[in-house]
């Protein structure tokens, strides 16, 4: 039994780091393998992650962490019974993939303005709470070409756009994702999308 693709890990910078790797053949990850992780820190203990299958030869492990700070560095040991298959390290702050924003809502009752709001996925005491920026994707269900991205570079989890910038009388969907420049993170996954029917009063034309 050998590791074909070494584990690569990303952290949500809160409580979970996810590591993925590939074996050289079909493997029952949960029964045959264990990933041990230990913070390089005084009096820390080793913790065990039981991997799950991720395709025939692929494995994925969700490492639970109490919290994360920038100095944290973990040793990783991948074991098959008594055999050490791979040894490595992982610094969560250098491989951050933020959590996806949630509770995306479109408020259509604000005159002819669309107000999109969502929730910051982090609690206020987490470092990323005040460092997230967002991208909002809006698209038409009827017209695949009607697809737009709004970059929200301020901290408030909301976006206002004029309803008239979208076509009237058709359905739109929106979703939002996050990233943090401070840790040069990857983008989060997209939030679940929300749907609304866009309608607004056409401005009265005077002849």
């Amino acid at each position: 039994m050998k590791v074909l693709q070494e584990p690569t890990c990303v952290s949500d910078y809160m409580s979970i780091s996810t590591c993925e790797w590939k074996m050289n053949g079909p493997t029952n990850c949960s029964t045959e393998l264990r990933l041990l992780y230990q913070l390089v820190f005084l009096l820390s203990e080793a913790h065990t992650c039981i991997p799950e299958n991720n395709g025939g030869a692929g494995c994925v492990c969700h490492l639970l962490m109490d919290d994360v700070v920038s100095a944290d560095n973990y040793t990783l040991d991948l074991w098959a019974g008594q055999q050490l298959l791979w040894k490595g390290s992982f610094k969560p702050s250098e491989h951050v993939k933020p959590r996806a924003p949630g509770n995306l809502t479109v408020h259509t009752n604000v005159s002819d303005t669309l107000l999109l709001t969502w929730s910051n996925p982090y609690p206020p005491d987490n470092y990323l709470y005040n460092h997230l920026t967002y991208a909002v994707n809006i698209w038409s269900e009827n017209d695949p070409a009607d697809f737009r991205i709004y970059n929200v570079t301020y901290l408030e989890p909301s976006l206002r756009i004029a309803a008239s910038t979208l076509k009237s009388g058709i359905s739109y969907r929106a979703r939002v994702r996050a990233w943090a420049q401070c840790y040069n993170t990857t983008w989060s996954e997209w939030s679940p999308s929300t749907k609304w029917h866009n309608s607004y009063r056409e401005p009265f034309e005077q002849h």
């Epitope: 820190f41 005084l42 913790h47 700070v69």
Partner: antibody, heavy 125, light 112 residues
Framework: EVQLVESGGGLEQPGGSLRLSCAGS????????MTWVRQAPGKGLEWVSS????????YYADSVKGRFTISRDNSKNTLYLQMNSLRAEDTAVYYC??????????????????WGQGTTVTVSS | DIVMTQSPLSLPVTPGEPASISCRSS???????????LDWYLQKSGQSPQLLIY???NRASGVPDRFSGSGSGTDFTLKISRVEAEDVGFYYC?????????FGQGTKLEIK
């Protein structure tokens, strides 16, 4: 009530051995790292040794390395310090103290928040 | 090893007056933002040491609010806003970021 009670101190000749015990109660003993600190007569405090909650990781002051062994029996909620090849400079009051919560991925630290009453070790011929 | 240096080593104080003890470490005790592994202990005559402050600024359970800790990196301070007679004893700072844990020499607080 959270409590630590040391025992095992006494008078021993240079080169001799003693085993100190520290019984913990009122907290989940196995979840916490434990530490020994000593104080020579009229002197300040000196760290001696620490052990993680499971007993896997141990740490020693250079002055006792190779002579002292820290261990624990979590089934008995007891911490030990086996002291061999004793020297006159090991004469001190020995305290055990409750250290950080080591079951967390980053051990949660609340200081050495509980101390025993101390047990006196005298090394003299 | 990290060297801890306390000052003053002797501190005579009038009851009701404030008192301040400084502790300097030979290297930073800041593991990461908000985690400065520096404690303050009080040892009264004939007693075991007792924890006053942990992680530089967190008051231990049951410690009167006249005691406060501050500082980060290498410079730390213990303040007593109004000294009481029961506060006499030796005050020690201690770092627990790295082994060996190291203590300051101790500051003897006495009533004038």
């Amino acid at each position: 009530e959270v409590q630590l009670v040391e025992s095992g101190g006494g008078l021993e000749q240079p080169g001799g051995s003693l085993r100190l015990s520290c019984a913990g109660s009122g907290f989940t003993f196995r979840d916490y790292a434990m530490t020994w600190v000593r104080q020579a007569p009229g002197k300040g405090l000196e760290w001696v040794s620490s052990i993680s909650g499971s007993g896997t990781n141990t740490y020693y002051a250079d002055s006792v390395k190779g002579r002292f062994t820290i261990s624990r029996d979590n089934s008995k909620n007891t911490l030990y310090l086996q002291m061999n090849s004793l020297r006159a400079e090991d004469t001190a009051v020995y305290y055990c103290a409750k250290d950080r919560l080591s079951v967390s991925t980053r051990p949660k630290y609340y200081g050495l928040d509980v101390w025993g009453q101390g047990t006196t070790v005298t090394v003299s011929s | 090893d990290i060297v801890m240096t306390q000052s003053p080593l002797s501190l005579p104080v009038t009851p009701g007056e404030p008192a301040s003890i400084s502790c300097r470490s030979s290297q930073s005790l800041d593991y990461s933002y908000g985690y400065n592994y520096l404690d303050w202990y009080l040892q009264k005559s004939g007693q075991s040491p007792q924890l006053l402050i942990y992680l530089a600024s967190n008051r231990a359970s049951g410690v009167p609010d006249r005691f406060s800790g501050s500082g980060s990196g290498t410079d730390f301070t213990l303040k007593i806003s109004r000294v009481e007679a029961e506060d006499v004893g030796f005050y020690y700072c201690m770092q627990s970021l790295h082994t060996p844990y190291t203590f300051g020499q101790g500051t003897k607080l006495e009533i004038k």
